[in-house]
Interface confidence: low
Amino acid sequence: CRTSECCFQDPPYPDADSGSASGPRDLRCYRISSDRYECSWQYEGPTAGVSHFLRCCLSSGRCCYFAAGSATRLQFSDQAGVSVLYTVTLWVESWARNQTEKSPEVTLQLYNSVKYEPPLGDIKVSKLAGQLRMEWETPDNQVGAEVQFRHRTPSSPWKLGDCGPQDDDTESCLCPLEMNVAQEFQLRRRQLGSQGSSWSKWSSPVCVPPENPPQPQVRFSVEQLGQDGRRRLTLKEQPTQLELPEGCQGLAPGTEVTYRLQLHMLSCPCKAKATRTLHLGKMPYLSGAAYNVAVISSNQFGPGLNQTWHIPADTHTEPVALNISVGTNGTTMYWPARAQSMTYCIEWQPVGQDGGLATCSLTAPQDPDPAGMATYSWSRESGAMGQEKCYYITIFASAHPEKLTLWSTVLSTYHFGGNASAAGTPHHVSVKNHSLDSVSVDWAPSLLSTCPGVLKEYVVRCRDEDSKQVSEHPVQPTETQVTLSGLRAGVAYTVQVRADTAWLRGVWSQPQRFSIEVQVSD
């Protein structure tokens, strides 16, 4: 037989269907020009050594075959001996490993069988009343089609569905939408109203995310605050990737889940902008402030649930970086300036109170003074840090205060407000005999000791009331007791204690009189 003709002889292999699960399937035949026809099919299974034969039976009962060799597509003309106007029955027989495998048959009128294309190009996916709506442009000159879809999830096989008849320049299909798993869809078309017309190939996969994007499961860690007053937020665990059906693995446009990082800077509420949204891949540097961090997942159907963390403020303090001078007009703070034209945010709150009670003040952009210092002043009338209690102060700086991720911590420290020298005076000073020439002096801790780093030392003063001689004894801020020795019996002494800060000398406590009894021997 000539290769261009259908061979009306017995095929060159035994006629026995193996009943194997593999083999040829999805046979499609159609007219491709005025006088030429094409049949194509799929072959499932190992392809080595397989020969395919296209079988054709005419309505007269005569049958013939085309030898296709290893190809799974074959063209013939209307001169090949095959009836094109009467219906013919076609199937493929594949001869492999000494056995024959047969495809299902198709019966059609070749001349009226037009090759239909699957949806080509962009298939638009949207959500409509809890269902999935797909829409695409009808391929050229192919208005009037039946459309089917098939869909699968990562864990389920293909399921077939019907889109119904289409008769317009655009075609559409309503499909089921899964809540929590991604789906792969494929569509195919065939000529409407043409008896036995072949289905097109399946379209390229359309990958659809679940209605609800997966909740992000991530963990963060925050590095130590660096010298520049910033600390890096790092992602310890990447968000779990959505499991995808087979045809969507690799590049699957449509199923992408975008994770965004929403930062909310809790400290320094008087600044212009408190929140910023970033891509999760771009991990920011943060100041030492307290933040709330949310990771928001979203897909093409919108945002999903988010996961929120609290990043506590860095409470590492720099006791010597801040100078505070209290004058008659008010109080001024000095600290090493960061750079030119910096905006500073000074935040303070009473120690031991909820973080929500922080107060803050934003300075205008300022340059360093000649000594390289930045300053902030307030009057007594403003009431700022006016109460005699311990305040926690943090100063933040930014050259771009409107950009949340460009703030840095300048310093954090404690400050005792109000009249610290008077308020810090130690009370309950008591004297106990210790030996024949020494006494033990005790006092209640100064209020300043509640303020870490503020109390520099206690000073105990002892005055000999006879000679008016005065001795002063420095005492560590953690101690509230000292032994005074070298005292003389029968002499009157007064003792006083004061509490000093780094920048203020305290007020002496009320004088406490005592003397050591003269010991009379029998």
Epitope: T3, S4, A68, G69, S70, A71, R73, L74, Q75
Partner: nanobody, 123 residues
Framework: EVQLMESGGGVVQVGGSLRLSCAAS????????VGWFSQAPGQDREFVGA????????DYKDSVKGRFTISKDNPKNTVFLQMDSLKPEDTAVYYC????????????????WGQGTQVTVSS
């Protein structure tokens, strides 16, 4: 990707013979049909003949049957077009191409063309 290279063309007297070669590199020819086409000046590319490489099945256009023979050398991954009893109307550039479509005579069904070799039949 398979690349094809034709050779063996030349000038020959009427009634003479030539043997053209089509050598493939970058892939095997086993899963292809190798077709020979001729293109005379100002004309479309026209099917001459083809061979299914895996089974050796050949196909020729009527006007060359009995004069032209297509064969292959499996180890060399090469197909030959033996041209005998040449006529002036056989003068053309000859190209080889690959297809997986059995019975394909349309150049549009072929891919991976070579650059061609000139055959001139002089009287």
């Amino acid at each position: 990707e398979v690349q094809l290279m034709e050779s063996g063309g030349g000038v020959v007297q009427v009634g003479g013979s030539l043997r053209l070669s089509c050598a493939a590199s970058g892939g095997t020819l086993y899963s292809y049909i190798v077709g020979w086409f001729s293109q005379a000046p100002g004309q479309d590319r026209e099917f001459v003949g083809a061979i299914e490489y895996s089974g050796g099945i050949t196909d020729y256009k009527d006007s060359v049957k009995g004069r032209f023979t297509i064969s292959k050398d499996n180890p060399k991954n090469t197909v030959f077009l033996q041209m005998d009893s040449l006529k002036p109307e056989d003068t053309a550039v000859y190209y080889c191409g690959l297809t997986r479509v059995v019975g394909a005579r349309n150049p549009g069904d072929y891919a991976y063309w070579g650059q061609g070799t000139q055959v001139t039949v002089s009287s």
